[in-house]
Interface confidence: medium
Amino acid sequence: EAHKSEIAHRYNDLGEQHFKGLVLIAFSQYLQKCSYDEHAKLVQEVTDFAKTCVADESAANCDKSLHTLFGDKLCAIPNLRENYGELADCCTKQEPERNECFLQHKDDNPSLPPFERPEAEAMCTSFKENPTTFMGHYLHEVARRHPYFYAPELLYYAEQYNEILTQCCAEADKESCLTPKLDGVKEKALVSSVRQRMKCSSMQKFGERAFKAWAVARLSQTFPNADFAEITKLATDLTKVNKECCHGDLLECADDRAELAKYMCENQATISSKLQTCCDKPLLKKAHCLSEVEHDTMPADLPAIAADFVEDQEVCKNYAEAKDVFLGTFLYEYSRRHPDYSVSLLLRLAKKYEATLEKCCAEANPPACYGTVLAEFQPLVEEPKNLVKTNCDLYEKLGEYGFQNAILVRYTQKAPQVSTPTLVEAARNLGRVGTKCCTLPEDQRLPCVEDYLSAILNRVCLLHEKTPVSEHVTKCCSGSLVERRPCFSALTVDETYVPKEFKAETFTFHSDICTLPEKEKQIKKQTALAELVKHKPKATAEQLKTVMDDFAQFLDTCCKAADKDTCFSTEGPNLVTRCKDALA
């Protein structure tokens, strides 16, 4: 229903705490360079204005849209052009073009320093002094680095952060209590970020229909006992929620997400038998829990998929009468039978089915033509299954770091033009798939591996879009989202690349590497590995292993030496010579 004052309506629905958190996230995601204090001031002004509108919905400007109110606030920031360049041009536009312009200027890779966690004592002191400000800083720092982070989910992670600090800051050994718990939250939040970015990419590039298809497949896998009408309703609502969040309408998004959670909990009987535990939780935990609830038990008596979609004499008639509905029911029926498939695979199968019907229903004898369609799915299913087996076997053999290195070599050969930091980031993220998915039961591996890889490759595509240096990458990123992962997997050594000459300075290291944390050390070594591959893209695995083992040995020896500097300056050139010879 229409409300006289949209801002008052959202403030009332969400409550002050969530309202302020969401406005802070929105501002931080739009203007990523502003300090926390600048944003906090704007948030307070917006909140005070919202309270005025709650008191009197007819007060001046209370009838304005949220985009108008928020956009006016952002455009009033001093020195906007100096700090944000052409983003300031957005302020010359009217809504809705102004908001679209802000969205286009969101930076997926802002030049901000990594978010460093303070040491435990300092963190606990500032948390105890002012928990609200502390959590505000957390929301601001995450949101500006991840401008498409799912806002209501970020509130959930802030709540987790808060609970961990409350618990650990009361302990004697704060450090050992905080570190593993906060690392766990950070890891989950980073995965949540790339997954949500993928959803927004799907929405931006291919529209609501594409996202809704994704949602139908995902929901059908999770709720196989819900009927098609129920799944369609949930998918439509979920599409609206995600569209709002991806579009920067964070208050509406959080409000509608809460409504969806409420609906699901009120209709458990027609959705799933697994929802009760989630529904007993408070709002943020409830919505989070529902988003990753375990799959319901599949109905025992499901007929073979062929009955309605291959053997039925009316297939072409049903398809012609309502294409989207018929394909939707196919996707629903196939997905609810296959919780062991990735959503990407299910969408590829639906696409194959659609293409088969398009072709066959125009022929003289359609049933003879589409009769083999299910058999034609086989290679599409085998390809990701083989990918999972090969990669999980490799992960089990090499461990996470070794697996990342294998992926780094592979991807540097596929796209040597891509900058080394981007290749290293991508390989490290792709390599985490092993730890994340390969330890799962067999039937959960494929959906975990492929949907995670797709999300990471989406980030590779977004970064590459900014500076499109590789025709290989451009080709894979230009196609449909569900074809990306198979496209990247199929890439081989880029023959158009002209290798760089071996440069000693690229492989010269100093004693400061010895004091770096393990993660930073790994990144340095992986940077060197990528540069080696760029120098010799056709180097064998054996040659690269020899060089990297020698390099690891060199670091180990010099970092243990009494006079580290001398060791690095004398042994370093010898290492370079040996590397050169090994790769000759």
Partner: nanobody, 115 residues
Amino acid sequence: QVQLQESGGGLVQPGNSLRLSCAASGFTFRNFGMSWVRQAPGKEPEWVSEISQSGENTIYADSVKDRFTISRDNAKSTLYLQMNSLKPEDTAVYYCTIGGSLSRSSQGTQVTVSS
């Protein structure tokens, strides 16, 4: 549509100089590191030199070091290669590239060093 148009090649005697230019369009030139690559008849392509986005960092193949200078003008979206003390073995087609790939669309410019 990314386009790279090389020019400035020609026939010169050993010891002389040439200045190659590469006009870039269809992308934000200042965001990319650029390089020169050359291919002599019947030989594999050879990397010559590379320059960072800002122009601050440059590296050269040993075979051209101290004779060739790479530079760029971001305002004009143009890459340059100043070639001094040319030798017969510098004879090749010279290509400017983004990221080090020989683009199918790039024509290159012929440099012939001969007495």
